[in-house]
Interface confidence: low
């Protein structure tokens, strides 16, 4: 029988009445155009909704937008368009919401052709009031907040000027011209690339990388011959053109660009690209595109300096620069990532790693599923997950995989069971242990979301017909109840719940269509009365993450330590609550070879934990360039994995000597870097 339809499923008592009392409809007085929704702050209940409608006239397009505000998680909305003087807001800039709980919002207005500059509306009180400000430039990008100080904003103009405000957009100053890309770093630092000759496109590969640490009073050129740059964790990356040809290489800095080292990664040609897939303060996952138009490349994982890389996964699917990759960080369990590979027969298969890219395997076949037509052997196959690539291919996949840090172990995704991803209609699968085991949760494609830190899962069937039914589960997707939230079905456009999965409110967005008109409508359902009581100690059980062999003393050890979590029992119907904090107990493991990367000049043969010398480097001195100095490496082939906390056990020898010799790539060496002040 389908999941949730067997006799074992107990019904939640009187849920229809409880939900009916907590279902709030809001019909927006709008013609249907586009709608965007933003949450302002955390646990504030404030939502801003911007609706825009374009009326094509003979000569031009006339636009109209409305702004609505809710302060009760979407149950009621108030039209606050008058606070922005009924101005048409440019949706391509979205609503720029300030970091943390700053309560700041910036909306960018559409202005008439001949105006000197753009116009913004600013609020610093969670959108209760707005101040109109005329800009001395036309913005090209959305205003970017400094992560450290929400009063500091930067924006690029259509003339490629870099503009900065120190008083939350009240006054603006152009700090540099001819800027291609600008990003906030840490400590209110701004990094940006500039062009000298014609344009960003013409100078690609000849850009300069600049830094200002004082909002434009002084500058330092920290790189030349730049193609592009990126920030990830504590790493600053730049791809730099080689002196001799059209190839480029990645350089990395961990001191804001004062010193650089060349990453031990393959160089790439004109048609190839690098992509930072994920980064934290310990390490980075880097994708390096394969030559030719293959649609795949290689994933490398870095050491703790971002310099030495280990090959992690071959034939990693990534279609083009800025194209599609299925790479997904499973945020509900440490060390877990899922992605797709393009196999030799050109089918697409899903792979998972539980140890931050050390090893990749196929996903275990769900117990309650049979292998589909893609499987050669009907009894042996794997689960394959649909993510961004499938969505871009217009397969019947409404949502990417979902996981939440505070819903420990839960992963929800569309998938098919076979030897490869299938183009047939997918089902929805759930894992409650971070991806080790999977169960079919729902037949056919659905939208889904997690509420109350995993206490409730909500789903809506993906259908081209109007809908009026929502499904919910209080036991991590084992059993499902259905609730008819309206008599009149709506064309469904999206589920919205507060980011962070702590809320118990879900908003169902859609539109009603009649012969003459169509209107936006939202239904907000509060599940607080379904989970009647607060969870107590007895509602939780101890769960060892990454456990695969309970007999083994080292069971659950990943990256040098194991973690025990307190998890809500599936049978407990209670509220984790908004203040729920994940309770975990870490314990350190003994070191084994699994806790070490292969060092520069070494690699791991398949299915072997030992690192062996690369044949082409056998007998050679291991020397590499670090911070512009030649280093000599004495190693027996191992380097501790970034973030690995193991102690004792195996301890391979490793020593690095400074050869006191200069070495530079074509990059600016530190002593040649220049500074200037405004």
């Amino acid at each position: 029988s389908a999941p949730g339809e067997d006799e074992e499923c107990g019904r939640v008592r009187d849920f229809v009445a409880k939900l009916a009392n907590n279902t709030h409809q809001h019909v927006f007085d709008d013609l249907r155009g586009s709608v965007s929704l933003s949450w302002v702050g955390d646990s504030t209940g404030v939502i801003l909704v911007l609706t825009t409608f374009h009326v094509p006239l003979v000569i031009m397009t006339f636009g109209q937008s409305k702004l609505y505000r809710s302060e009760d998680y979407g149950k009621n909305f108030k039209d606050i368009t008058d606070l922005i003087n009924n101005t048409f807001i440019r949706t391509e800039f979205g609503m720029a919401i300030g970091p943390e709980n700053s309560g700041k919002v910036v909306l960018t207005a559409e202005v008439s052709g001949g105006s000197r500059g753009g116009r913004i509306f600013r609020s610093s009180d969670f959108a209760k009031n707005f101040v109109q400000t005329d800009l001395p430039f036309h913005p090209l990008t959305q205003m970017m907040y400094s992560p450290q100080n929400s009063d500091y904003l930067l924006a690029l103009s259509t003339e490629n000027g870099l503009w900065v405000s120190k008083n939350f957009g009240g006054k603006w100053e152009e700090i540099h011209k001819a800027v291609c890309l600008a990003k906030w770093g840490s400590d209110n630092t701004i990094f940006f690339t500039t062009y000298a000759n014609g344009s960003c496109k013409a100078d690609l590969g000849a850009l300069e990388l600049w830094r200002t640490s004082d909002l434009g009073k002084s500058f330092k050129t920290i790189g030349v011959k730049i193609y592009s740059f990126g920030l990830g964790g504590r790493f600053l990356f730049a791809s730099v053109m080689a002196d001799k040809d059209t190839t480029r290489r990645i350089h990395v800095s961990t001191d804001q660009g004062d010193t650089w080292s060349m990453a031990q990664l393959p160089s790439v040609g004109q048609e190839q690209f690098y992509s930072i897939l994920a980064a934290n303060d310990d390490m980075v996952f880097m994708h390096v595109d394969e030559p030719g138009d293959t649609g795949f490349g290689t994933i490398f994982t870095s050491d703790d300096r971002g310099i030495v890389y280990s090959k992690s996964l071959d034939r990693h699917l990534y279609t083009t620069t800025g194209g599609e990759t299925d790479f997904t960080n499973v945020t509900s369990l440490r060390g877990v990532y899922i992605t797709s590979v393009l196999s030799e027969d050109n089918s697409i298969q899903t792979m998972i790693t539980f140890d931050q890219g050390g090893r990749w395997t196929h996903l275990r076949k769900p117990e309650n599923s049979e292998c589909d037509a893609t499987a050669k052997n009907k009894n042996e196959c794997s689960l394959h997950i649909h993510a961004s690539y499938s969505i871009s291919q217009k397969l019947n996949v409404p949502m990417a995989p979902l996981s939440e840090p505070n819903a420990v172990g839960i992963v929800i995704a569309h998938g098919s069971v076979g030897d490869a991803i299938s183009v047939m209609v997918p089902d929805v699968y759930i894992s409650d242990d971070g991806g080790y085991s999977w169960t079919k949760m729902l037949e056919g494609p659905h939208y889904y979301t997690i509420l109350d830190s995993g206490g409730i899962i909500v789903a809506i069937e993906h259908s081209s017909r109007p809908i009026n039914v929502i499904k919910f589960s209080t036991d991590e997707g084992q059993c499902w109840q259905t609730y008819t939230f309206t008599r009149d079905p709506i064309y469904f456009t999206g589920l919205a719940s507060e980011p962070g999965a702590r809320s118990m409110n879900i908003s169902i967005w859609g539109f009603t269509e009649s012969f003459l008109t169509s209107q936006w409508v939202s239904y907000t359902i509060d599940f607080k009365d379904i989970l009647e009581r607060n969870c107590e100690e007895k509602d939780y059980t101890i769960w060892l993450a990454h456990s695969t062999d309970p007999e083994d003393y080292e069971d659950g050890c990943i990256l040098g330590y194991k973690e025990q979590f307190l998890r809500l029992r599936k049978s407990s119907v209670c509220q984790n609550g908004r203040d729920y904090v994940v309770t975990k107990q870490p314990s350190i493991c003994l070191c084994s070879l699994e806790d070490f990367l292969c060092d520069f000049g070494y690699y791991r043969p398949e299915n072997d934990s030992k690192c062996v010398e690369q044949p082409e480097l056998k007998g050679h001195d291991l020397e590499f360039c670090l911070y512009g100095r030649e280093e000599h490496l004495t190693t027996n082939g191992y380097r501790k994995i970034p973030g690995d906390k193991c102690q004792g056990g195996v301890n391979p020898v490793r020593e690095v000597k400074d050869l006191k010799k200069k070495c530079t790539s074509n990059f600016l060496s530190p002593e040649k870097q220049n500074s200037k002040s405004n």
Partner: antibody, heavy 129, light 107 residues
Framework: QVQLVQSGAEVKKPGASVKVSCKAS????????MSWVRQAPGQGLEWMGI????????SYAQKFQGRVTMTRDTSTSTVYMELSSLRSEDTAVYYC??????????????????????WGQGTTVTVSS | EIVMTQSPATLSVSPGERATLSCRAS??????LAWYQQKPGQAPRLLIY???TRATGIPARFSGSGSGTEFTLTISSLQSEDFAVYYC?????????FGGGTKVEIK
């Protein structure tokens, strides 16, 4: 310039199979889907299915399921459509058409449709005993 | 599958006149609709995609409108080269489906 060149006309007996090729040039082959559409004499257009050149995945119209196979060879930028168990009502002109709803043109969850923007010249398949 | 219905089946128009062709979908296809022109012995040619965007090289006299289930192709002033069969096609849900076609002939 961008073009799709199809193989020549075929005459087949009922029960046989036919394999039509479609060679793409003038663009990056793996960046676009390829659809196959047929047109019986004096009739309208009928979509048969679609292939994604980068992964080789396919989706066929229910009517042709089990009888049609679409494949591709990225080394020669060619797609193939094979139709088996031919019957007289399969007599038609078969077209391949580039379908830019494919790979690099759409961001996730985009619903925008670009239409079949480049068509082959057509291959006439006659099924007769 | 989504059924596309075109009307009229035949439209007789004089050169220089306006022609309005209709296409109806059995369920909403949003704006995932294209229009094609086909002349005898030739492959179809894309005219309009995304319900209302003219394809490259298509004259401004061709325009598309509509969203959901009702769509219209308008030829503002028919030229001699415009007499042909016109098809609409949806790509909202697989399988892609075509309308039966509207033949525009000289009055």
């Amino acid at each position: 310039q961008v073009q799709l060149v199809q193989s020549g006309a075929e005459v087949k007996k009922p029960g046989a199979s036919v394999k039509v090729s479609c060679k793409a040039s003038g663009y990056t082959f793996t960046k676009y889907y390829m659809s196959w559409v047929r047109q019986a004499p004096g009739q309208g257009l009928e979509w048969m299915g679609i292939i994604n050149p980068i992964g080789g995945s396919t989706s066929y119209a229910q009517k042709f399921q089990g009888r049609v196979t679409m494949t591709r060879d990225t080394s020669t930028s060619t797609v193939y459509m094979e139709l088996s168990s031919l019957r007289s009502e399969d007599t038609a002109v078969y077209y391949c058409a580039r379908d830019p709803s494919g790979i690099a043109l759409l961001g996730p969850a985009s619903r925008y449709y670009y239409g079949m923007d480049v068509w082959g010249q057509g291959t006439t398949v006659t099924v007769s005993s | 599958e989504i059924v596309m219905t075109q009307s009229p089946a035949t439209l007789s128009v004089s050169p220089g006149e306006r022609a309005t062709l209709s296409c109806r979908a059995s369920q909403s296809v949003s704006s995932n609709l294209a229009w094609y022109q086909q002349k005898p012995g030739q492959a179809p040619r894309l005219l309009i995609y995304g319900a209302s965007t003219r394809a490259t090289g298509i004259p401004a006299r061709f325009s598309g409108s509509g969203s959901g289930t009702e769509f219209t192709l308008t030829i503002s002033s028919l030229q001699s080269e415009d007499f042909a069969v016109y098809y609409c096609q949806q790509a909202r849900l697989g399988p892609w489906t075509f309308g039966g076609g509207t033949k525009v002939e000289i009055k």
